[in-house]
Interface confidence: low
Amino acid sequence: EQKLISEEDLAAKTLVLGKEGESAELPCESSQKKITVFTWKFSDQRKILGQHGKGVLIRGGSPSQFDRFDSKKGAWEKGSFPLIINKLKMEDSQTYICELENRKEEVELWVFKVTANSDTHLLQGQSLTLTLESPPGSSPSVQCRSPRGKNIQGGKTLSVSQLELQDSGTWTCTVLQNQKKVEFKIDIVVLAFQSTAITAYKSEGESAEFSFPLNFAEENGWGELMWKAEKDSFFQPWISFSIKNKEVSVQKSTKDLKLQLKETLPLTLKIPQVSLQFAGSGNLTLTLDKGTLHQEVNLVVMKVAQLNNTLTCEVMGPTSPKMRLTLKQENQEARVSEEQKVVQVVAPETGLWQCLLSEGDKVKMDSRIQVLSRGVNQT
């Protein structure tokens, strides 16, 4: 079993933290503050590099073997003889010895690596696992901050379940060891629709357009919109399509709806003429290599009609219980206002009538009809 290196063990050594793939500078200082003979060695006494009195950097082995090791010649005159290790590898984690002025200084280098599970492109709802690889004997703690400021912390593995769109961006992971810190940046892309639900409010006969912007464009996949009209008890397919190289192609479509799907991203679906029978809810699914994304779609349709001696305003589709339907003559007090889906006025006066669907002080939709004279039928 690997023994943890205690604070006391490290006290005699200088500790340097590094990141895999980057560079580390191991310090070695002369008390004289001037150029002097020095040698850097591995702990097994193999020479790495040094300066033996002529101001020339001498390497301890063949250039191919030692090309990652260097020093800062410009610092030698000030009595500083650092060992620079480039393109750090996990196996560089060890003790290095600097010999100068008849003394030896030990520097412990610990190289860390933080990686994201399998891929940095994940679907909304999936889990992100960040794994810290650390040298034997180290006991770091790690804390990561998401782009929206949420802190997660733990030992060698940190997990975040149910990723959201706002988790896209740069995650900052700070590794803390013996009061020293090293910071990692990991760019995570959460593949998602940019909103969780879309609701369109339309008067009968109008066109409805749904746009489904994605926060990515480089993925291929296929999708389908399943629809459940309010009057139905089942979902049925409205349209299926594929996305390839940012182009959208319709595979199958319900004939009577005359649905139109834009050929380029963002996904845009148009219903040329809505009617009460279309009102309801749908589920758009987009299947990618990594899994499936879902988007809820709602269509609320309003119809105002005059039949015989009655003016009727009707709404169909997913409305909230707090929504109110109001039928009134324009610029006059509300004649009828109910928290329900149908309101009627018998024997309406001639003039312009307005039907409003509102929630609190927000009007969701407004449909108007000109009442010509009592007893006339119009839709």
């Epitope: 400021g149 009061q179 910071e183």
Partner: antibody
Amino acid sequence: QVQLVESGGGLVKPGGSLRLSCAASGFTFSDYYMNWIRQAPGKGLEWVSYISSSGSTIFYTDSVKGRFTISRDNAKNSLYLQMNSLRAEDTAVYYCAREDYSNYEDYYYYYTGVWGKGTTVTVSS
Amino acid sequence: EIVMTQSPAALSVSPGERATLSCRASQSVSSKFAWYQQKPGQAPRLLIYNASTRATGIPARFSGSGSGTEFTLTISSLQSEDFAVYYCQQYNNWPYTFGQGTKLEIK
């Protein structure tokens, strides 16, 4: 000893700009996350912004996004807050604060242990 | 954002007595939670971090407890210098948020 000293406050008209500075001493400035926190007259405390030790990670509270910019100069041991398009509701004492941490049982905990004395910003016509 | 609610808004206690201040978070903040003391014209002073750890130089009469959403600051025997405004704060999610404060007054 560890010290944070804010400067740059003053009276400014709505829509105007100010730049606050915070001079740090007595510690290795480049090792610490830094923060700006404000307190409106007679009111509670509100976090405005923080910046990571390297300056690469920055957060703002929603009410100042797009108007305020936090920055740091580790070589000068200084923290800054550039405030543009100032509003009356930005009137407050602005504190510069250091985010410390303690390592405990494989976790570490942040806390704002060191504060400056504050600088007053008044936005009024 | 996480809303921190302190109670009571003001508390009158006699010196030498015990004072208990409460703070509730609108969602769990684990133990990433701190208490601060502020006197007029001064910057806040950290008392407790990590919900229950006393900051350097803070007397033992101050103690913090709780985790998740419910937190308590207890001052076991009030001294004259303890009368001030106390703020709670979470640092689990950005934006970090403070409670509205509890004013501790001399009875």
